[in-house]
């Protein structure tokens, strides 16, 4: 009779996580009698995976009935494979004894586990930034194997090139993680923009995973301020409007000051959205000219999204005339946009106002 050989025909086997792995092993002889054992790894620290003679191995099933006569097929099937099962498996023949004596090992079969990456999670900056600034977005995905993976960034469908990607760990592992940081230059038109992180991996059958982040979470578009004044009404009142335009997000507080005194404070709410995702807001102030002897300096003070206040001032000229006469009043837009903060004092009952 020929000398026993233990044959493991496959050098490597690749299996998707969750599936079963079949590890093939045949012996060339029934002699000597004795059990087959399967191990992962070699040396004293090797892990027993299956013992034909004894033990309970709930995930392992012999492919051939071990009680079958003339059985020389010692292949096993391992169910519900996870990345932790990766490694090299050895089919080892033992000679019957007390204890059994190791006789011959197969050459080993390397089991690699194809595990899908987790859905990419994209996170943006902790604080908002304004147009022309560069912000960083991070994309993370975990638990994939093998290590080879492709990650791309897109902004509104256009591929980005300014990003850095790391796959960890650098050495051999049962599974890997990827982390990529992309730098994106903001524009005022980016409220509706989206960044997409796209991950392609062998386990995804050409259908990449995507994670998205809305630039609306990262951008701040500061407002433009504009004054307009309507001509004097018969009741000596002038309607002055402060237009707050093209801002995002909606969080905005507007304060009217008359000669430096707070006249009214308003909070923006439930504003209609512009096509580009920004908001406009108009506030009116009725100035009772007859209540003033001198020119009135009006200031529209806007605090947007917790940023320092932006001021726009405007002078309403009060002509010298008897109060009862309906005389013309000149108004002048000073055109100043000032940044600075004010003390807010609600003085709403000083004048009659009409506002939206």
């Amino acid at each position: 009779e020929e000398e026993l050989q233990v044959i493991q025909p496959e050098k490597s086997v690749s299996v998707a996580a969750g599936e079963s792995a079949t590890l093939n092993c045949t012996a060339t002889s029934l002699i000597p009698v004795g059990p087959i054992q399967w191990f992962r790894g070699v040396g004293p620290g090797r892990e027993l995976i299956y013992h034909q003679k004894e033990g309970h191995f709930p995930r392992v099933t012999p492919v051939s009935d071990p009680t079958k006569r003339n059985n020389m097929d010692f292949s096993i099937r391992i169910s519900n494979i996870t990345p932790a099962d990766a490694g090299t498996y050895y089919c080892v023949k033992f000679r019957k004894g007390s204890p059994d004596v190791e006789l011959k090992s197969g050459a080993g079969t390397e089991l690699s586990v194809r595990a899908k990456p987790s859905a990419p999670v994209v996170s943006g900056p902790a604080v908002r930034a304004t147009a022309e600034h560069t912000v960083s977005f991070t994309c993370e995905s975990h638990g994939f194997s093998p290590r080879d993976i492709t990650l791309k960034w897109f902004k509104n469908g256009n591929e980005l090139s300014d990003f850095q990607t790391n796959v960890d760990p650098a050495g051999k592992s049962v599974s890997y993680s990827i982390r990529s940081t992309a730098r994106v230059v903001l524009t005022r038109r980016d409220v509706h923009s989206q960044v997409i992180c796209e991950v392609a991996h062998v386990t995804l059958q050409g259908d990449p995973l995507r994670g998205t982040a809305n630039l609306s979470e990262a951008i701040r578009v500061p407002p433009f301020l504009e004054f307009t004044q309507q001509s004097m009404r018969a009741d000596n009142q002038v309607n002055v409007t402060c237009q707050v335009m093209k801002f995002y997000p909606q969080r905005l507080q507007l304060t009217w000051l008359e000669n430096g005194n707070v006249s009214r404070t308003e909070m923006a709410s439930a504003l209609p959205e512009n096509k580009d995702g920004t908001y406009n807001w108009t506030s009116w102030l009725l100035v009772n000219v007859s209540a003033h002897r001198d020119d009135v300096k009006l200031t529209c003070q806007v605090e947007h999204d917790g940023q320092p206040a932006v001021n726009k001032s405007f002078s309403v000229k009060v002509s010298a005339h008897p109060k009862e006469q309906g005389s013309n009043t000149a108004a002048e837009n000073t055109g100043t946009n000032e940044r600075g903060s004010s003390d807010y004092k609600d003085d709403d009952d000083k004048h009659h106002h009409h506002h939206h």
């Epitope: 009779e1 029934l30 009698v33 013992h51 003679k53 033990g55 071990p66 009680t67 019957k96």
Partner: antibody, heavy 119, light 110 residues
Framework: QVQLVQSGAEVKKPGASVKVSCKAS????????INWVRQAPGQGLEWIAM????????HYNQIFKDRATLTTDTSTSTAYMELRSLRSDDTAVYYC????????????WGRGTLVTVSS | DIVLTQSPDSLAVSLGERATINCRAS??????????IFWYQQKPGQPPKLLIY???NRDSGVPDRFSGSGSGTDFTLTISSLQAEDVAVYYC????????FGQGTKLEIK
């Protein structure tokens, strides 16, 4: 350490039945055949039958096919051999034996159960 | 059915001498490249013990003075140098089909 522990001696009347048990330990019970062999006093070995505990497949010696029944209880790793319609010439030591190599051989043996059939 | 016939029925050999027991099958027991013959030793009051499997392979723990040989229909168990503890009845068994035993050979010391 493979061990096969058999039930105690039995005395039966002709025509009765006997059920001998064999409790296995030290190995995976369902992975190996169990054989039953008997030996009448001063006589040779006579193979009765064998059973695969994994699926209860059985093979019987034609001589015993109608009178012997082999069963197993995998939850307790115990094999049973029942012999019916006992006659005086069924008086023998009944052995269970495990087939370690699936070669239809008998590698490990119980110590035997003496069944005496006498009126 | 295959019938096994052992010879002699009994045998007396001096300590240290060679003992030879034969087993003849009524038809060949060779199949799949193996000779399906096994040899057992049974001492008084004990169950049998497997000595040789597949005609020529010593079971674990069996002293190397025991050897098996033969092919097809004729097989031999040899004890090269008889020891006192070898006194027993020896049986051959085949499993070419369902198992049967030879009638046994009683070995004694001369």
């Amino acid at each position: 350490q493979v061990q096969l522990v058999q039930s105690g001696a039995e005395v039966k009347k002709p025509g009765a039945s006997v059920k001998v048990s064999c409790k296995a330990s030290g190995y995976t019970f369902t992975n190996y055949w169990i054989n039953w062999v008997r030996q009448a006093p001063g006589q040779g070995l006579e193979w009765i039958a064998m059973i695969d505990p994994s699926d209860s497949e059985t093979h019987y010696n034609q001589i015993f096919k109608d009178r012997a029944t082999l069963t197993t209880d995998t939850s307790t790793s115990t094999a049973y051999m029942e012999l019916r319609s006992l006659r005086s010439d069924d008086t023998a030591v009944y052995y269970c034996a495990m087939d370690y190599g699936s070669l239809y051989a008998m590698d490990y043996w119980g110590r035997g159960t003496l069944v005496t059939v006498s009126s | 059915d295959i019938v096994l016939t052992q010879s002699p029925d009994s045998l007396a050999v001096s300590l240290g001498e060679r003992a030879t027991i034969n087993c003849r099958a009524s038809q060949s027991v060779r199949s799949s490249g193996y000779n399906w013959i096994f040899w057992y030793q049974q001492k008084p009051g004990q169950p049998p013990k497997l000595l040789i499997y597949l005609a020529s392979n010593r079971d674990s723990g069996v002293p190397d003075r025991f050897s098996g040989s033969g092919s097809g229909t004729d097989f031999t168990l040899t004890i090269s140098s008889l020891q006192a503890e070898d006194v027993a009845v020896y049986y051959c068994q085949h499993s070419r089909e369902l198992p049967t035993f030879g009638q046994g050979t009683k070995l004694e010391i001369k």
